[in-house]
């Protein structure tokens, strides 16, 4: 199952179930862990372990919690105010600016280079030239992850209204 949020993954715009806590918006916004009701009068709590909101908002939905992909480990579970934190398994890494997937770390350095940094969940091994000490950027090109959009929820007539 994809860990990416598409429109289909948003919690539906529905009246709060009886067990969902309600409070009043403050200056039109609801606190983290809540979303606003359709009439704008109530803040409805997100469902623990299912969806979340991390910031003050007037969203009509909470966001679906991420499920860690295979090849990832869960560092911390999803709460009503924070999404799941996933980390690449040992021997794989995901760079800060690379697509959202874990890539295998290289097992060794090219000829004429020495390893100066280990594989971590966020970086490949680091190699430098024996003589010059200059870094080697690594030959493995970033793998693109293709995400196609799904039809999702029908468009709201007054989105991001301004």
């Amino acid at each position: 199952e994809s860990a990416l949020i598409t429109q289909q993954d948003l919690a539906p715009q529905q009246r709060a179930a009886p067990q969902q806590k309600r409070s009043s918006p403050s200056e039109g916004l609801c606190p983290p862990g809540h979303h606003i009701s359709e009439d704008g009068r109530d803040c409805i709590s997100c469902k623990y372990g299912q969806d979340y909101s991390t910031h003050w908002n007037d969203l009509l939905f909470c966001l679906r919690c991420t499920r860690c992909d295979s090849g990832e480990v869960e560092l911390s579970p999803c709460t009503t105010t924070r999404n799941t934190v996933c980390q690449c398994e040992e021997g794989t890494f995901r760079e800060e600016d690379s697509p959202e997937m874990c890539r295998k770390c290289r097992t060794g350095c090219p000829r004429g280079m020495v390893k100066v940094g280990d594989c971590t969940p966020w970086s490949d091994i680091e190699c430098v030239h024996k003589e010059s000490g200059t870094k080697h950027s690594g030959e493995v090109p970033a793998v693109e992850e293709t995400v196609t959009s799904s039809p999702g929820t029908p468009a709201s007539p007054c989105s991001l209204s301004g």
Epitope: I5, T54, H55, L59, T66, D97, E100, S149, S159
Partner: nanobody, 124 residues
Framework: EVQLLESGGGLVQPGGSLRLSCAAS????????MSWFRQAPGKGREFVSY????????AYADSVKGRFTISRDNSKNTLYLQMNSLRAEDTAVYYC?????????????????WGQGTLVTVSS
């Protein structure tokens, strides 16, 4: 992939207002997750505001809550960030980001399309 171009930055006095624009081209934005991030000198990119193009509502960082508002104009394919009561600590390069799907809406890594940024300087 969508192309984004920000504008509207500049020098403003504390307490003043600015409206940033993010013009999108390349494809329709229906269903897109849209966010504003900012980057102050020597710091990482910080989440500012989030919304979905064709759904109501937005989320705001604590630091801008009640002062900044995200909006959009369908006919112009443009996202806006209205910034009021500006403070010196709002000084940064502001970036617009978009993605058809996101993993964590407040994480810069979740977005695959970025504008080049527009500089906002708040100073007297």
């Amino acid at each position: 992939e969508v192309q984004l171009l920000e504008s509207g930055g500049g020098l403003v006095q504390p307490g003043g207002s600015l409206r940033l624009s993010c013009a999108a081209s390349g494809r329709a934005l229906t269903g897109y997750h849209m966010s504003w991030f900012r980057q102050a000198p020597g710091k990482g990119r910080e989440f500012v505001s989030y919304g979905i193009w064709d759904r109501a509502g937005a989320a705001y960082a604590d630091s801008v809550k009640g002062r900044f508002t995200i909006s959009r104009d369908n006919s112009k394919n443009t996202l806006y960030l209205q910034m009021n009561s500006l403070r010196a600590e709002d000084t940064a390069v502001y970036y617009c980001a978009a993605s058809m799907a996101v993993r964590t809406y407040y994480s810069p890594r979740s977005y695959d399309s970025w504008g080049q940024g527009t500089l906002v300087t708040v100073s007297s």
